[in-house]
């Protein structure tokens, strides 16, 4: 899977959207590596 910074950001945004925003606050692009997905 794509692991550029932009890909990670968009994937995380999708995950947050699907979770209804309940993902913990420190789950942000600069803290999350591509392996987290």
């Amino acid at each position: 899977a794509c692991d550029t910074a932009t890909c990670v950001t968009h994937r995380l945004a999708g995950l947050l959207s699907r979770s209804g925003g309940v993902v913990k606050n420190n789950f942000v692009p600069t803290n999350v590596g591509s392996k987290a997905f």
Epitope: C2, T4, A5, T6, C7, H10, A13, L16, P29, T30
Partner: antibody, heavy 119, light 107 residues
Amino acid sequence: EVQLVQSGAEVKKPGASVKVSCKASGYTFTDYYMNWVRQAPGQRLEWMGDINPNSGGTNYNQKFKGRVTITVDKSASTAYMELSSLRSEDTAVYYCASIIIVPNYFDYWGQGTTVTVSS
Amino acid sequence: DIQMTQSPSSLSASVGDRVTITCKASQNVDTNVAWFQQKPGKAPKSLIYSASYRYSGVPSRFSGSGSGTDFTLTISSLQPEDFATYYCQQYNNYPYTFGGGTKVEIK
């Protein structure tokens, strides 16, 4: 309101260096990557590199062969792009840009900084 | 580096026309493509990410499609404010690369 405000226009001599700043507000600066993109007159956009403001980790476009350095000052919520060994072809508008998720999912861009390289 | 080839480089159209701009990547970039609109003297404005998703606030007349190497931006009914230059960008691999732009002019 998310804003990326860049420093003012610069005129430099060939061989000199320029450092452009980008002050972020309206979001948590360290949460999102910052990109730098430039556009020479009449040319396509060109990605220069990005930085993780949280860790300081960077990715660069190898076209610039070590001439570009991207840094941040977390305490000032400001990103910097320094380009060294300037030549006339570096005359361009330089932009910072960041994709933010919170408070609004959008790709925000600075207003641009014109750098003119001329002897 | 991945090359992004846009076509046409310019086009003339009238208000209300349907406009299609294409972008071809030199290798597979999945759906990791964005589209931008730029007006003279202004910063680019983001329209589309992940090939087909509109950012909030982007009018529904703008739509994107494609995957792999072939991508399309469509403006279903051109409005006066849409006359601008449009760029595609791939962010699947570093360095990110942009297409050469398509200038949409008034006929």
